[in-house]
């Protein structure tokens, strides 16, 4: 049968696409009869000899027989029987192994709609950018939650694209994480970098106590610091009881001796005793609050001739407790800048910083900050918070460490910092941030862009507002149209260009009288809301002779749809056959809701409009 | 091009000495520290020492500490290991290798092809 | 000293298969990790550093991931010269030390 390719008129708001249709079909057994399941639960793999090939069901296959299928039989099925067999398995509960998963995942190239009939375990080696919908990720990540993430290595490339996917999904911006949120994220909460342990330690520490495995170095470093805090949901640990320490239970081998010191040494001892006699607890975990490094504290006095006079390489091969007792914590802080040219191992940098945080317990004076050097990677956010930086000279030493790497919760936190100290984000200080991170522009919210100043625009480049949101734009464009108010036409425009993501309708209209020639990589990221007031004839202005390529966008946001919202007469003007406009006698109703639903307007065909039509002629007649 | 070609091995009875040499080539030596590996017959790889800037700076693996000294001729680009007091347990394949530029890695980027040390009566 | 584990000890694998071989360390060793590929008779070869870094000229399948004490060496696309033995190494702290090695052999 030959499918229709026409849009529907009557009845087009919200219709079910057809593939929705025949699925259900095939679910119910319309399109491949089903037959009664095998009730055998053998748990040994049958050989199976190309048994998936060509039985009359697969849902008739034994769990046993169907337990170690190899991947090389899967290779040769059709997506149909792949998606058959992986309900089948789903519905005798067989247990599949990462390799078998990861393959049946590899052949089923659409994104499956019936979730809920694959196995659940199967869903972390499908691609989560083909449920992008906030209905289809929604229902994949609620999915997820269930499902055994642990199965996957943290490393593995199939992990590491489910968390940054499921905050996308479940809408979080930025590191502030809700109770709601570590929920949505079950068993990927565990991968949550530092920086959302940092902002959001109240919901996420008592989650991370059941991570299974290490947590990693940033996110150690990031719980070490807000336990220290002393903040919610534990307090500071100088009043931590028994029931404190029992509730942190899978977090305590991140404890750093500053915080089992302030542990009050009667509940540490209460506790241990207690643990001792309890064999569920695991080993590890009991021997992080034992006297730590017996060996090491019994050498705490510096070796004769090894006192540190000066910071230079002879201190390269110093161990982790000669350092700690040989060099002094002042001789430190008045030679940080030698410290960048020593190779010292990153055990070592850790001593050292150490020592800086005991002397200086409020937070580091500008003049150490300046010298950090690579010392910077190894503060933590809270570190940084503690810092008053107001020199530009510092701030460029720092980012220098960087240079080369994504922006981390570090720098993000100096930025911050930084800014807040000169109180809006002058000129200077966005040539430099924008000259190591083209994107920093576009980490800010809203309200942080708000102040910056219309004078700072003009050190904005375009390659700086290429990850802005339409709502950062929204905040900048009227900053960027007050900046360069005083530009002639065609200068104007090459200036105001990449900020027009934010701009208005009339300011549009008023564009397209200029022939200006947009590209349409421009149109293209301009809003939609913007967009669907301009008439076929102002595009044409606007666009001048780049129009031509909306034959290629049609179907892409906002020219798709701009195009619904124009008569198909008009847009056969253009001669670039550009179809879905509205056909002559039909009525657009704009139906806000309704649109906001479905996505597309609803389109009432010749009967209805007649009907509108004598009811407003009567109406004005009477 | 970067290169390393070690000498200086051979049979040694158990408690004698023998001296290693290194000679680099093709980068500039005295920017980078320089280590001494070593692996046994059929055995994995051992750090057994390393030197920085001058040559004043020195690190061993306290299996030779005391017994193996590194240290280095930046004119004339050699990296060098006296070896005393010898055991069984020394014999080993012994590489030089440099230090990769990137910091903290302490990988070693460039090694030689090894020369063989067999301490036995 | 910091203790390295590798896993397995040996494995067996045809051209175009993906290999994966483990590293863990004693205590947690950040990033600082590096793989090295060794064959008979020759001086080991750095294939990846600080955990994820490819050497130049090192070919794209191989690739590095893990952090902390967990650390995995994924070749994705196995070929006649990768079979070899591999050896992780920390350079987080002196002295530094090398896995026991992973053998990989033509199945």
């Known amino acids: 049968m030959a499918l229709p390719t026409a849009r529907p008129l009557l009845g087009s708001c919200g219709t079910p696409a057809l593939g929705s249709l025949l699925f259900l079909l095939f679910s119910l057994g319309w399109v491949q009869p089903s037959r009664t399941l095998a009730g055998e639960t053998g748990q040994e793999a049958a050989p199976l000899d190309g048994v998936l090939a060509n039985p009359p069901n697969i849902s008739s296959l034994s769990p046993r027989q169907l337990l170690g299928f190899p991947c090389a039989e899967v290779s040769g099925l059709s997506t149909e029987r792949v998606r058959e067999l992986a309900v089948a398995l789903a519905q005798k509960n067989v247990k599949l192994s990462t390799e078998q998963l990861r393959c049946l995942a590899h052949r089923l190239s659409e994104p499956p709609e019936d979730l809920d009939a694959l196995p659940l375990d199967l869903l972390l080696f499908l691609n989560p950018d083909a449920f992008s919908g906030p209905q289809a990720c929604t229902r994949f990540f609620s999915r997820i939650t269930k499902a055994n993430v642990d199965l996957l290595p943290r490393g593995a490339p199939e992990r590491q694209r489910l968390l940054p996917a499921a905050l996308a999904c479940w809408g979080v911006r930025g590191s502030l994480l809700s109770e709601a949120d570590v929920r949505a994220l079950g068993g990927l909460a565990c991968d949550l970098p530092g920086r959302f342990v940092a902002e959001s330690a109240e919901v996420l520490l008592p989650r991370l106590v059941s991570c299974p495995g290490p947590l990693d170095q940033d996110q150690q470093e990031a719980a070490r610091a807000a336990l220290q805090g002393g903040g919610p949901p534990y307090g500071p640990p100088s009043t931590w009881s028994v029931s404190t320490m029992d509730a942190l239970r899978g977090l305590l081998p991140v404890l750093g001796q500053p915080i089992i010191r302030s542990i009050p040494q009667g509940i540490v001892a209460a506790w241990r005793q207690r643990s001792s006699r309890d064999p569920s607890w695991r080993q590890p975990e009991r021997t992080i609050l034992r006297p730590r490094f017996r060996r090491e504290v019994e050498k705490t006095a510096c070796p004769s001739g090894k006192k540190a006079r000066e910071i230079d390489e002879s201190l390269i091969f110093y161990k982790k407790w000669e350092l700690e007792a040989c060099v002094d914590a002042a001789l430190l802080a008045t030679q940080m800048d030698r410290v960048n040219a020593i190779p010292f191992t990153y055990e070592q940098l850790d001593v050292l910083k150490h020592k800086l945080d005991e002397l200086y317990p409020q937070g580091y004076p500008e003049s150490v900050i300046q010298h950090l050097g690579y010392l910077f990677l190894k503060m933590s956010p809270e570190d940084i918070r503690k810092w008053n930086v107001t020199s530009l000279e510092t701030l460029k030493a720092l980012l220098e460490v960087n240079k080369g790497h994504e922006m981390s919760p570090q720098v993000a936190t100096l930025i911050d910092r930084f800014v807040k100290g000169r109180g809006q984000l002058d000129k200077d200080t966005l040539d430099t941030l924008t000259a190591f991170y083209p994107g920093y522009l576009c980490s800010l919210s809203p309200e942080e862009l708000s102040s910056v100043p219309p004078s700072s625009i003009w050190a904005v480049r375009p390659q700086d507002l290429d990850t802005c949101d339409p709502r950062q734009l929204d905040v900048l464009y009227p900053k960027a149209r007050l900046a360069f108010q005083n530009m002639n036409g065609s200068e104007y425009f090459v200036k105001i260009q990449s900020f027009l993501g934010g701009a208005p309708t009339e300011d549009l209209k008023a564009l397209s009288q200029q022939n200006v020639s947009m590209d349409l990589a421009t149109f293209m990221k301009l809003r939609t809301d913007a967009v669907l007031p301009l008439t076929v004839a102002e595009v044409q202005k606007l666009l001048g002779p780049h129009v031509e390529g909306l034959k290629a966008e049609e179907r892409h946001r906002p020219v798709r749809d701009w195009i619904l919202r124009q008569r198909q007469d008009d847009l056969d003007t253009l001669g670039l056959g550009l179809q879905g406009g509205i056909p002559n006698g039909y009525l657009v109703l704009d139906l806000s809701m309704q649109e906001a639903l479905s996505g597309t307007p609803c389109l009432l065909g010749p009967g209805p409009v007649l009907t509108v039509l004598a009811l407003l002629l009567a109406s004005t007649l009477a | 091009e970067v290169q390393l070609v070690e000498s200086g091995g051979g049979l040694v009875q158990p408690g004698g000495s023998l001296r290693l040499s290194c000679a680099a080539s093709?980068?500039?030596?005295?920017?980078?520290?320089m280590h001494w590996v070593r692996q046994a017959p059929g055995k994995g790889l051992e750090w057994v020492s390393s030197?920085?800037?001058?040559?004043?700076?020195?690190g061993y693996a306290d299996s030779v500490k005391g017994r193996f000294t590194i240290s280095r001729d930046n004119s004339k680009n050699t990296l060098y290991l006296q070896m005393n007091s010898l055991r069984a347990e020394d014999t080993a394949v012994y590489y030089c290798?440099?230090?990769?530029?990137?910091?903290?890695?302490?990988?070693?980027?460039?090694w030689g092809q090894g020369t063989l040390v067999t301490v036995s009566s | 000293d910091i203790q390295m584990t590798q896993s397995p000890s040996s494995l067996s694998a045809s051209v175009g298969d993906r290999v994966t071989i483990t590293c863990r360390a004693s205590?947690?060793?950040?990033?600082?990790l590096n793989w090295y590929q060794q064959k008979p008779g020759k001086a080991p070869k750095l294939l990846i550093y600080?955990?994820?870094s490819l050497q130049s000229g090192v070919p794209s399948r191989f690739s590095g991931s893990g952090s902390g004490t967990d650390f995995t060496l994924t070749i994705s696309s196995l070929q006649p010269e990768d079979f070899a033995t591999y050896y992780c190494?920390?350079?987080?702290?002196?002295?530094?030390?090398f896995g026991q090695g992973t053998k990989v052999e033509i199945k």
């Open positions: 030197i920085y800037g001058s040559g004043g700076h020195t």
């Open positions: 600080a955990t994820s």
């Open positions: 190494q920390q350079s987080y702290s002196f002295p530094f030390t």
């Open positions: 205590q947690s060793i950040s990033n600082w």
């Open positions: 290798a440099k230090q990769h530029a990137y910091r903290y890695s302490y990988a070693f980027d460039v």
């Open positions: 093709g980068f500039t030596f005295s920017d980078y520290g």
